[in-house]
């Protein structure tokens, strides 16, 4: 980028620049056309026959050089072949010397300072490149000379720049003073100010542009260099903030539009919001979960809300006695998620009818929640009383949303307890053909034992059809019509109003082989 | 502002010499051209020729050509044109100008004239 | 040599009115082409240069146009001073043979 400090191109009025000496053949200031047809004020000189050693000065007005340590002049002539002037001397040159002098202010007048080299800095002798010819019988041809010098380094507030004349016949169209500085640049989402190099390169801290954040690492910089040009290097850079995406080749950031959203500072743009969810507003770094729809505090930021889950479904209960075997549907809607889980709460009610929450002596295996395979074996239920099962499905944000837990409930009644099984048989008589038994009465829990079943066989006599069953009130009974010397095993079970009970373990009894042992009574 | 100062009338026999002289106030001199046109008597412009000082020699019309002398004298600023062989027809105000902008301050080769001389009279007759 | 033909020879306008004058060459002289106004007794004035580009201290409602070799000067407004002949003349074939054009007097109708 270039900053002018000059330009005559732009003169509308009179120059006025200082000339030495105040002789004829000096330096004149004259209207001049440039290549856009453009009125220029120039300077022109032509004394080709001047004394050797005669020089005609041209002197700028003072220029602030505002800041700038390097000044470029870009200077357009042209200049006349001194073969082409056929009264041109030897002092004819095609060639003039550019100085410049600085001062902290508009202080040179028409004599100071002294017209030569030091106090004025010589910066070049400018040779033209293009000399204006012209030969007999045909029209003059030229083209435009242009050279661009550098000046300084300047310390100083403002310098004047000034051309000296030895003898060639020339014009200078136009002085274009101006100097470079970088221009301001956003990179990588990093913006770095306009900059004057001081150097060869100078260190240019940047700032990451709005609603950017610095990337992680040493805070971006570049090199502006003497030219004006960014020193090409990698730039660590800025990123856009939450909510906002890179846009215009990475120049600025630019918030999420409604609907989108971004999670993270970083790379990457706005994506749409993620299933169950909105952003109402631009520039969301996360999306709304709808109403009714939740994420986990586990969930990332970009995860679709979830719903917690229906019910489980079609619970299948198994009684066996004081265990229960509960299984269930998965609920037809999941929420969205992977993490379901079951749980079951418990209510039992005594057979007087009073309910309260399940005590501690059932037991659920696995467990009573979390659990994830949909099914139970509840151990340790009393008989007679009614059980209700409320089996919840759970997952990730159950804990989330407020109301009632949907549930599926089961009910099971226990039976009352039947008697225990009947053990201690003893065998009171023992004939050819019969035998006489008793035992204990087995203490019922659900009222008195109403009567007894008595079942026995001949020992290796398996079949069903060798089975035969005896019915007696007492807590005795007499097995007629058996084989003499026989082998028989028995069994008895007792029924009270909750039923029978289970039969008790098988014991062996043996008929006598003769009368003569007849009735004897034995002890089992 | 540059003022062309010509030389007054003259009157002149057939076959005779005329010069008219163009002298230039103010100013570089030597790197414009100067041009001589002439106007017969109810005629339009006709373009002679031109001289840019600097240079010496001069650029003649076809019509011209053999016929007239474009000088130039840089030390005292002043253009000649010298017509030779004269003839009736040569009867006619003869003006130098100048062009608008010198040999090394146009970009373009115009030779557009916006300084005139107030014309001289030149009269052929026996 | 180049030719250069001005039409009309003359015409007649009165104040006010918006005159055009043409001029052809007879090759393409590009832009290179001068309009000058001259009045009876006097040295002519340049108004225009390079077809279009209006010389210093000339009214604005002068104006050139064309390139190649058909070029216009436009008189927007005829004010009572404008009453002259107008040549053009061209600029670009060396020698410059054939220079102006025949010339247009603008009368006072």
């Known amino acids: 980028l270039e900053e002018t400090l000059l330009n005559t191109k732009l003169e509308t009025a009179d120059l006025k620049w200082v000339t030495f000496p105040q002789v004829d053949g000096q330096w004149e200031e004259l209207s001049g056309l440039d290549e856009e047809q453009h009125s220029v004020r120039t300077y022109e000189v032509c004394d080709v026959q001047r004394a050797p050693g005669q020089a005609h000065w041209l002197r700028t007005g003072w220029v602030p050089r505002r800041g700038a340590v390097h000044v470029y002049a870009t200077l357009r002539f042209t200049m006349l072949e001194c073969l082409s002037l056929p009264r041109a001397g030897r002092s004819c040159k095609e060639t003039f010397t550019v100085f410049y002098y600085e001062s902290d202010a508009d202080t040179a007048t028409a004599l100071t300072p002294a017209w030569m080299e030091n106090p004025y800095i010589k910066v070049d002798t400018v040779a033209a490149e293009h000399l204006t010819r012209k030969r007999p019988g045909a029209e003059a041809t030229g083209k435009v000379n242009v050279k661009t010098l550098r000046l300084g380094p300047l310390s100083k507030a403002g310098f004047y720049l000034a051309f000296q004349d030895q003898g060639a016949c020339m014009a200078l169209l136009s002085l274009h003073l101006f100097y470079k500085k970088c221009a301001q640049l956003t990179v990588n989402l990093t913006r770095f100010p306009e900059t004057v190099p001081r150097e060869l390169v100078v260190p240019v801290a940047g700032s990451c542009v709005v609603d950017a954040v610095p990337a992680p690492g040493p805070s971006p910089s570049l090199y502006c260099r003497e030219d004006g040009q960014w020193a090409e290097q990698p730039v660590t850079g800025c990123s856009c903030a939450p909510g906002f995406e890179a846009a215009e080749g990475n120049t600025k950031c630019r918030a999420c539009a409604q609907g989108t959203f971004k999670p993270l500072s970083g790379e990457g743009s706005c994506q749409p919001c993620p299933a169950n969810s909105h952003s109402n507003t631009i520039g969301s770094a996360v999306c709304q979960c709808r109403v009714g729809y939740f994420r986990a505090r586990t969930d990332p930021r970009g995860a679709p809300c979830t719903t917690p889950p229906s019910a489980p479904r079609s619970v299948v209960s198994r009684l066996n006695g004081s265990s229960l075997h509960l299984e269930w549907s998965a609920p037809l809607e999941s929420g969205g998620r992977e993490d379901l889980t079951y749980a079951l709460r418990c209510r039992e009610c005594r057979p007087g009818g009073s309910c309260a929450p399940c005590g501690g002596d059932l037991t659920f295996d696995p467990g009573p929640r979390d659990l994830v395979e949909p099914w139970v074996v509840v151990r340790g239920l009393r008989p007679d009383f009614t059980y209700t099962f409320e089996v919840t499905a759970l997952n990730g944000v159950s804990s989330l949303a407020t109301g009632p837990v949907p549930f599926e409930p089961v009910n099971v009644t226990t039976d009352r307890e039947v008697p225990p099984a009947v053990s201690d048989i003893r065998v009171t008589r023992s004939s050819p053909s019969s035998l006489s038994l008793a035992w204990a009465v087995p203490r019922a829990p659900s009222g008195a034992v109403l009567d007894y079943e008595v079942k026995y066989h001949e020992k290796g006599a398996e079949g069903p059809s060798s089975v035969r069953f005896l019915k007696t009130s007492e807590n005795r009974a007499e097995l007629r019509g058996l084989k003499r010397g026989a082998s028989y095993l028995v069994q008895v079970r007792a029924r009270s109003e909750a039923g029978y009970g289970p039969f008790g373990q098988e014991h062996h009894s043996q008929t006598q082989l003769d009368e003569s042992e007849g009735w004897r009574e034995q002890l089992a | 502002q540059v003022e062309l100062v010509q030389s007054g009338a003259e009157v002149k026999k057939p076959g005779s010499s005329v010069k008219v002289s163009c002298k230039a106030s103010?100013?570089?001199?030597?790197?414009?051209?100067i041009s001589w046109v002439r106007q017969a008597p109810g005629q339009g412009l006709e373009w002679m020729g031109k001289?840019?000082?600097?240079?010496?020699?001069?650029d003649y019309a076809q019509k011209f050509q053999g016929r007239v002398t474009i000088t130039a004298d840089e030390s005292t600023s002043t253009a000649y044109m010298e017509l030779s062989s004269l003839r009736s027809e040569d009867t006619a105000v003869y003006y130098c100008?100048?062009?608008?902008?010198?040999?090394?301050?146009?970009?373009?080769?115009?030779?557009?004239?916006?300084?005139w001389g107030q014309g001289t009279l030149v009269t052929v007759s026996s | 040599d180049i030719q250069m033909t001005q039409s009309p020879s003359s015409l007649s306008a009165s104040v006010g009115d918006r005159v055009t004058i043409t001029c052809r060459a007879s090759?393409?002289?590009?832009?290179?082409l001068n309009w000058y106004q001259q009045k009876p007794g006097k040295a002519p004035k340049l108004l225009i240069y390079?077809?279009?580009i209006l010389q210093s201290g000339v009214p604005s409602r002068f104006s050139g146009s064309g390139s190649g070799t058909d070029f216009t000067l436009t008189i927007s407004s005829l004010q009572p001073e404008d009453f002259a002949t107008y040549y053009c003349?061209?600029?670009?074939?060396?020698?410059?043979?054939?220079?102006f054009g025949q010339g247009t007097k603008v009368e006072i109708k």
């Open positions: 100008a100048r062009s608008s902008y010198t040999i090394l301050t146009t970009y373009y080769n115009y030779n557009a004239m916006d300084n």
């Open positions: 001289i840019i000082p600097i240079f010496g020699d001069a």
């Open positions: 103010g100013g570089t001199f030597s790197t414009y051209a």
């Open positions: 090759q393409n002289i590009n832009n290179f």
């Open positions: 003349s061209q600029d670009h074939f060396y020698p410059p043979s054939g220079t």
């Open positions: 390079g077809s279009s």
